[in-house]
């Protein structure tokens, strides 16, 4: 097992025996799971690929970065990691593509250090409200979390249960105002087709906000004007159509924000005028001149920067006597 | 209540393969997990693999490792046991069960099938 004079790159590994043999009492300092990797010098254990089914009970004191990815977890009970002497230095956990579709409350209870959770890459079907506040109360303890990334977190279609997917992470996420701290929120790849119009104003101290790759078609009902730290967002790769004036306002209005916009299927109407005359004069859209029209087909691969409003004509609606069939 | 149907047992030689079968009746969406557990003439009944409905995720008992697979198909509520290198000590009952927990013990499983033989011999 590792010493404390151990250099950070040099990884110690357990024998397989340790791990059942001492369970049951408090971690040795210098011990390592089975299955896993440690450093005492970097604070690092890494259990990564071994299909480890629970997370392991003899995880180090010391261990402030813990990688348990690749595993077959399938569920976080509650107080997953809850020891006793507590992992006070618990600082970056990352469960990415460990098979988790179960997240139950009070799973990251008793980790008062832990600032970034990653949970992407798995099916996680059935995520509790209170599996990041850990409690039901309507005011929970602030949790420590800074960085949550939650990107691919959506099960395949047919293993989804009958509910909101949206409304199921979006009361994670706000349940008992515990991550008012938050500052990086990545929610790509989700098939998101709206987001609900309470989550971003919850989330004051939000920098970073990533919504890319998902199926968001409008924001006409998401305000930004309660971000003021926003520094990017994220919106690359959605089925955005156009982006209305309250929306241009509120996102004019943040004093630090980047937006990312591309490769979405924006229509170029008469609708599209506010925003085209507004990218013009903005520079908080990144890579501006890439966006291009989607529809109609008369407009498709038209740069948006390079539109006036005479491009940009409705169809006259014909009163119903003059329709033909 | 979910019915559970194993099929697919019979005698094979050491060294030989079998794939048993489990069909669900319904999908049980209250049941997040399907197990084979096994039963040899006069001991109890010992858990062999677990598969997870959603995700996918799996997981043995030591002694099968390596040796065999579980797998589900969504589309047609069905768990199936993939078993090679058979032995002897392989032979016993097979039992289907589902049930809530992402557990080892006999106790995690609510509903059981009836069991299908496999038998190892020369």
């Known amino acids: 097992s590792s010493s404390p004079t151990s250099s950070a790159s040099s990884f110690s590994s357990s024998a397989p025996f340790l791990a059942s043999a001492v369970s049951a009492q408090p971690p040795l300092p210098d011990q390592c799971p089975a299955l896993c990797e440690c450093s005492e010098a970097a604070r690092t254990v890494k259990c990564v690929n071994r299909n480890l089914t629970e997370v392991p009970t003899d995880l180090p004191a010391y261990v402030r970065n813990l990688f348990l990815t690749g595993n077959q977890l399938a569920v976080l009970p509650a107080g997953a990691f809850a020891r006793r002497p507590p992992l006070a230095e618990l600082a970056a956990l990352n469960l990415s593509g460990s098979r988790l579709d179960e997240v139950r409350a009070g799973a990251f209870e008793h980790l008062p250090s832990l600032r970034q959770l990653d949970l992407s890459h798995n099916p996680l079907a059935d995520l509790s409200p209170f599996a990041f506040s850990g409690s039901n109360a309507s005011v929970s303890a602030p949790s420590p979390l800074v960085e949550l990334i939650l990107n691919h977190i959506v099960p395949p279609e047919d293993e989804r249960q009958n509910r909101s997917f949206e409304g199921m992470v979006v009361a994670a996420l706000l349940a008992g105002r515990a991550l008012q701290g938050l500052r990086r929120l990545e929610l790509a790849s989700n098939h998101f087709l709206y987001l609900p119009r309470d989550v971003l104003a919850q989330l004051p101290s939000l920098r970073h906000l990533d919504l890319s790759n998902n199926s968001l078609v409008s924001l006409t009902y998401v305000s930004f004007r309660n971000l003021t730290h926003l520094e990017s967002l994220h919106l690359e790769d959605n089925a955005l159509k156009v982006l209305h004036n309250g929306t241009l306002a509120e996102l004019q209005g943040l004093p630090h924000i980047r937006v990312f916009l591309d490769n979405n299927p924006w229509v170029c109407d008469c609708h599209m005028a506010d925003m085209v005359t507004w990218l013009k004069e903005t520079e908080v859209v990144q890579g501006k001149d890439r966006l291009t029209c989607a529809y109609p087909e008369k407009m498709r691969n038209r740069v948006l920067l390079e539109l006036n409003s005479a491009d940009l004509d409705c169809d006259p609606i014909l009163p119903p006597s003059l329709q033909t069939s | 209540e979910v019915q559970l149907v194993e099929s697919g047992g019979g005698e094979v030689q050491p060294g030989g393969s079998l794939r048993l079968s489990c069909a669900a009746s319904r999908r049980p969406f209250s049941s997040k997990t399907m197990a084979w557990f096994r039963q040899a003439p006069g001991k109890e009944r010992e858990f062999v693999a677990a598969v997870r409905w959603i995700g996918g995720a799996t997981r043995y008992t030591e002694s099968v490792k390596g040796r065999f697979t579980i797998s589900r198909d969504n589309a047609k509520n069905t768990v199936y046991l993939q078993m090679s290198s058979l032995r002897a000590e392989d032979t016993a009952v097979y039992y289907c069960?589902?049930?809530?927990?992402?557990?080892?013990?006999?106790?995690?499983?609510?509903?059981w099938g009836q069991g299908t033989l496999v038998t190892v011999k020369p």
């Open positions: 069960a589902a049930g809530q927990a992402w557990g080892t013990k006999f106790t995690d499983y609510s509903d």
